[in-house]
Structure formats: C-alpha cells, structure tokens
C-alpha cells in the first residue's frame, strides 16, 4: 500500500515587537521533532498593528487592549486551536519604550503593564513582556540573519539555499535600523574587543563566536532626525528653517514643544522665541549629508578606534545584512541591488533629493505624505551613518547587502528571541540521527 | 609579518612574479596592498587585494598588473611587459582591516628591488 | 578621478619647531586617511589613521586633524629624529585612481 503522510507533528510561536515607530506581530512555525535542527523555523505570518508604538500610549493606557485585538486575533486564526495553549507568546520592546524609561520608569511599567494583561487574555501561552537592551537586539539579529543564511549548520552543502549565501561559513555581521536606535554586530577578525559592554560571547551547534555589538540609542532614522531638527533650529535666525533633507517647496509646521519632547535631542534644547517653526524644503543632498555629519561626534576616541560618540568599533570583517529600516528605504528608493556602487547610490539621492516636492507627491501617489516626505533625509541618513559612523568605504560597501527577508523570514531581532527564549538554539552540535520511523506508515 | 620575494634584473617587455609571504595572521581577515617607490620617488599603489579576494588595481596598472591569493599565506604581483620604468622598490603591506584600506597599512615589507634594463 | 594633493614637497623646521603638512582630497573621503613616515632606505611606518588617530608606538607630538576634505598632520616640538618623507594616504576607494598617495613632503630638521 501506498505511504500516507501523518498529520504534520508542528509548534509555533509568535513575537511581537514593540518599536518605536509600530508593533508588529510575527508568528513561526517548526517541525516539533526537528528542533534542534539549523534552519527549521520560518515565518509563516507578519501582521502589522495599526497606529503608532506603545511608547505613544502613555496617556491613553485603556486603549492597548483594542489597538492589540487585529494582530491578536488573526494569530488565533493562523494557529490551529489544538496548538494554542503550547504557542508561546512573548513580546519584546526596544528602543521607544528605552526612552519612556528614560523619562519616567514608572510610565514605562505601566504601559507594559496593561500591554501584558491584554495578552495574557488570548488563549496563548504568554511569556511575558519586557523591555528588551540594545546588546540583545543586536545579539538576536545577528543569530537571525546566520541562523536564516544557514552559517550555523555545519553540514557543507553543495548547492546553495539563499542568494546571499558565501561558499563559507564565515557569519554574515547586522546592521540593523529602527526608528529610535541602530545595532551594529559582528565578529571582529582575530581581534580583541575592547570594551566589555561591546563583547559577546556565544557557544552555538559547537563552535563558539566573539561576538561585537552596540546599539546607538537616539540614531534611529526618527530620533536622528529629530535631532538634526533641534541642531539645525538652534542657529535658524527665525521660525523658519530652510532644510536641505526635504524635497524643493516641501512645507511643514513643527511645535517646539514636539521637538525637545524626546531625550534624544535634550543636547541640543535652548529656549526658542517662537512655538512653532516651519520646515521649507530646499533638497540639496550635500548639505544635507553635511548637516546630519555633525550629529557624529568623531573628534573623541579613547580605544584604539571609535564608531562615533566615543563608542568602540573594532576593524570591519566580513559580508554584513542591512535590514529593517535599511532595507525598507533603499527599496523604496530602489537602491537594494548587489550591483549599486556606493558612488552611483550617492549620485540617486542628489538626484532624489532634488526633485520638486510637487513632482515627487505625483510619482509616488499611493504613499503616505509623512513617510514619502522622509525618504530624502532617511536615504542621506543610512549612507551617512555607514559611511561616517562606521566606516564602510567606497571598497566595503560591496560588502553591505540590503534584506528585507530571508527564506521568506523577515531579518530582525524577532526569530533569534525567540529561538534563544525556547532553546532551540542548542550551545553544542546535536548528533544526527537516522530519519525517524514513524515519519511514514 | 610580511616580507617580498622575487625581485631581480629583467629585460625590457619580459615577465616578473613576486611573492608576498605573510605570518602570524591569516590573509581571510585581512588586505594585502602591493605599493612600488621609483629610486628617489614617491609611493606609488599599485593594488590591493581584500580578504574576500576582491582585487582593486591602480588605473595605469590595469592590464598589466595581476594581484592573487596563491596559498593561505601568500600574495602574488605578476608583473607584464616590463619597461625601464617600472624599475622600483617593491612593498606589500597588510591592511588594518579586511574589507577595506580605510584604516591604513600597519605592517609593510623590506621590500624587493626590480630592475627592468637591457 | 579621486586625487590626494600633497602641500608642501619639502620643509624646513628649527628642532623644537612645529611643521604642518596638508593633504587635500578632491571628494569627500569620510576621514579615511593615514600618515606614514619614510626614512632613507627603510620602508614606510604608519604613524595616523582614520584621520587622527595615533598608530601604536606613535608619540604625541604627532597629531593628525581633519577639516572637509583637508587633512593634516602637524608635528610640534620637532626632534632630529623626525627628518623623514611623509606621505598621507586615501583609503576610501581604490576603484578609478591613479595613486592612493599623495606625493610626499621631505622634513629637514635644522
């Protein structure tokens, strides 16, 4: 008779990520006898909370619960409902709610408060909620990306599963961007990391990683602007600021108020005569790029060398995944590909920068205002923060590939949290075994 | 370390290889630069080649100069259609970083004299 | 094409004194620049990288900066030992270039 497949023996689990700018919901799938195994877990769903981050809930606490129910809801669907009482649930916020807890610790409980009772009514195994350090969203999305391109497995394969796979199993670094703070991780050639809060260290299928990650807490694309904002208005002699990073004949009012609202720009308050100041776009790429270089303190160094602000950054090495933010710019600004030379993405945004704001609202007319009017200054951002943070040359960025996913997987911290929370990345190699019997009957 | 090897006399339009041979660090971490000095010149690039075995070559030594990984400590330059002013000083040096020369070279040759005459 | 040009080609400096040298690049090299010293019959030695940055065993008197695309290294206090070549050197790219170095200024100590 003819082998018929058993119901798939399958777990899932599911991670919300709480940035600064929105929520969004990831749920994962994986083989129950193969957990263990490189590679198994991928994502079967990404759904995207409407409205802003949690941090912005602040006053309005009571209205959590619905702004959770959509994503929530559409999990209780995906899941079968025999698998929901073992679907682990857990929620990790970075660095929106790092600077809640900047201003009031007890502001920031209490919006993890109410997001924490308004899970713990689904039928899922919640695990908790929590904010999560800058070191372990760079940890977690650096073991995403090389967990996803397969780096960990040491079995040598002869063909290759994803397009951006080396013929080694050299890992890949993370350059992640998110709207508050950006994550640098790699492992450094033989090379020692000079300040212990940059070193990790991991014991992952066997083989151990030195690991080097920081996380810039106020250089996200949203606070780095912000901050560029509270530079730039500081020697503007009125309430209105002519601004190179917005597009020709782009208009927009800004409450001061708004402005020093946020930790991130506190270095740059001063007592303004005015309330309000209008953004008048100019669209000139270079001074743009001039502008947001001086937000890069390099002039202090105490380690043999630095990234910015005094921060240690060792050597370059290897190929590195751009995601998140990165990549969502670059896509839209259709830079992504392999093939873009630094010089050329630079000529793209003297050109994009300096479209009239009237033509680029008639090219990209399905996009949003408030995001399409960001692209000039988030496009100059990233190549300011690669070029003059880290230091990736003309020669390096070859090196830089941008990834929204990978195997169908998002790239970001959410896949390798959640890994590590249900250990399902073992610290040693697990002895292969023969294909299990009851497979097939 | 890393020290050339290779340099000698050769006739005008003829063929050279020189070695660089590195220890005590691994060439898939690091660049190798080749940098020539005419007598009494300046230095002069030649090339480089990064950790990932991607080669970047001076516009006037396109052509005629080849930079390759030949073993896991060693770097050739081949050398082609040699003239008398190609006569120089010959350096490898190591690059501080291995996916770009941003940080400098923090570890040269004695270098390897190449004199191109009839 | 990106060019370094180095100023001057030759300086003369009272030991005790102080001498500038400047590099400038003709594009925005994002401070990917190093200082190297010749002596007669030896090979070069870094002294800076990434613009101002101090290479190991480098002593303070040397010192690098960087305004725009110009970079320079100053050397107060100039000691005997200091006659040597200088050279300052691009590290920012290496594709459509003639010389990553520019041309060298000769230090006479007096």
């Known amino acids: 008779t003819q082998n018929k497949a058993l119901p798939e023996n399958v777990k899932y689990g599911i991670v919300l990520d709480a940035g600064s700018s929105h929520t969004s919901l990831y749920i994962y799938k994986w083989p129950a006898e193969k957990e263990n195994d490189t590679g198994v877990v991928h994502q079967v769903e990404e759904c995207r909370v409407k409205g802003p981050g949690i941090s912005k809930f602040v006053q309005k606490v009571n209205e959590i619960g619905i702004y959770l129910t959509d994503c929530m809801e559409r999990a209780r669907e995906v899941i079968p409902r025999s698998q929901h009482q073992e679907t682990p649930v857990y929620l990790g916020a970075t660095a929106g709610m790092r600077l809640l807890r900047m201003e009031s610790e007890e502001l920031a409980d209490r919006v993890l408060d109410v997001v924490e009772r308004s899970l713990s009514n689904y039928p899922f195994d919640f695990q908790g909620a929590r904010i999560i350090t800058g070191q372990e969203e760079g940890a977690y999305g650096w073991i995403t990306i090389n967990y996803l391109l397969g780096k960990f497995s040491q079995k040598t394969r002869w063909f290759s599963i994803v397009p951006y796979e080396t013929n080694n199993q050299e890992t890949f670094g993370a350059l992640d961007l998110g709207g508050a703070s950006t994550q640098v991780t790699f492992v450094p050639q033989n090379q020692t990391i000079e300040s212990p809060d940059n070193a990790l260290q991991f014991r992952l299928y066997g083989k151990d990683y030195n690991v080097y990650t920081h996380s810039f807490l106020c250089y996200g694309k949203d606070q780095a602007l912000w901050q560029k904002l509270a530079k730039d208005i500081q020697v503007a002699s009125n309430e209105i600021l002519r601004d190179p990073c917005f597009h020709p004949g782009y208009k927009k009012v800004v409450n001061v108020s708004d402005l020093y609202k946020t930790p991130c720009t506190k270095r740059f308050e001063m007592t303004l005569p005015f309330q309000q100041f209008e953004i008048q776009g100019i669209g000139n790429y270079q001074q743009c790029h001039q502008s947001i270089l001086e937000l890069f303190n390099t002039s202090y160094c105490p380690y043999s060398q630095c990234a910015f602000n005094g921060i240690f950054l060792p050597p370059l090495q290897g190929d590195f995944g751009a995601f998140s933010a990165f990549y969502f710019v670059m896509k839209f600004l259709n830079l992504t590909s392999e093939k873009v030379s630094q010089e050329k993405v630079t000529e793209m945004m003297k050109k994009f920068c300096a479209q009239p704001w009237e033509e680029i609202k008639t090219s990209y007319a399905g996009v949003k205002e408030k995001y399409l009017s960001e692209y000039c200054f988030s496009g100059t951002y990233i190549l300011s923060l690669l070029l003059q943070g880290y230091h990736f040359t003309a020669d390096s960025w070859e090196h830089i590939h941008f990834i929204g996913k990978i195997q169908g997987s998002d790239a970001g911290w959410t896949l390798g949290y959640m890994l590590n929370l249900t250990n399902m990345i073992p610290a040693e190699q697990p002895l292969s075994t023969p294909l299990s019997h009851s497979t097939y009957v | 370390s890393v020290k050339e090897a290779g340099g000698r006399l050769v006739t005008p339009g003829g063929s050279l290889t020189l070695t660089c041979t590195v220890s005590g660090f691994s060439l898939s971490a690091y660049g190798i630069s080749w940098v020539r000095q005419a007598p009494g010149k300046g230095l002069e690039w030649i090339g480089i080649?990064?950790?990932?075995?991607?080669t970047y070559y001076a516009n006037w030594a396109k052509g005629r100069f080849t930079i390759s990984k030949t073993s896991s400590t060693t770097v050739d330059l081949k050398m082609t259609s040699l003239t008398t002013e190609d006569t120089a000083a010959y350096f490898c040096?190591?690059?501080?970083?291995?996916?770009?020369?941003?940080?400098?070279?923090?570890?040269w040759g004695p270098g390897t004299l190449v004199t191109v005459s009839s | 094409a990106l060019v370094m040009t180095q100023t001057p080609s030759s300086v003369s400096a009272a030991v005790g004194g102080t001498v500038t040298i400047n590099c400038q690049a003709s594009q925005n090299i994002y401070s990917n620049l190093a200082w190297y010293q010749q002596k007669p019959g030896q090979r070069p030695q870094l002294l800076i990288y990434?613009?101002?940055t101090l290479a190991s065993g480098v002593p303070s008197r040397f010192k690098g900066s960087a305004s725009g695309t110009e970079y320079t290294l100053t050397i107060s206090g100039v000691q005997c030992d200091d006659a040597a070549t200088y050279y300052c050197q691009q590290g920012f790219d290496s594709s459509n270039i003639d010389n990553t170095f520019g041309g060298g200024t000769e230090v006479v100590v007096t």
């Open positions: 990434r613009a101002s």
């Open positions: 080649i990064y950790s990932s075995g991607r």
């Open positions: 040096a190591r690059s501080r970083a291995g996916i770009s020369s941003g940080d400098g070279f923090d570890s």
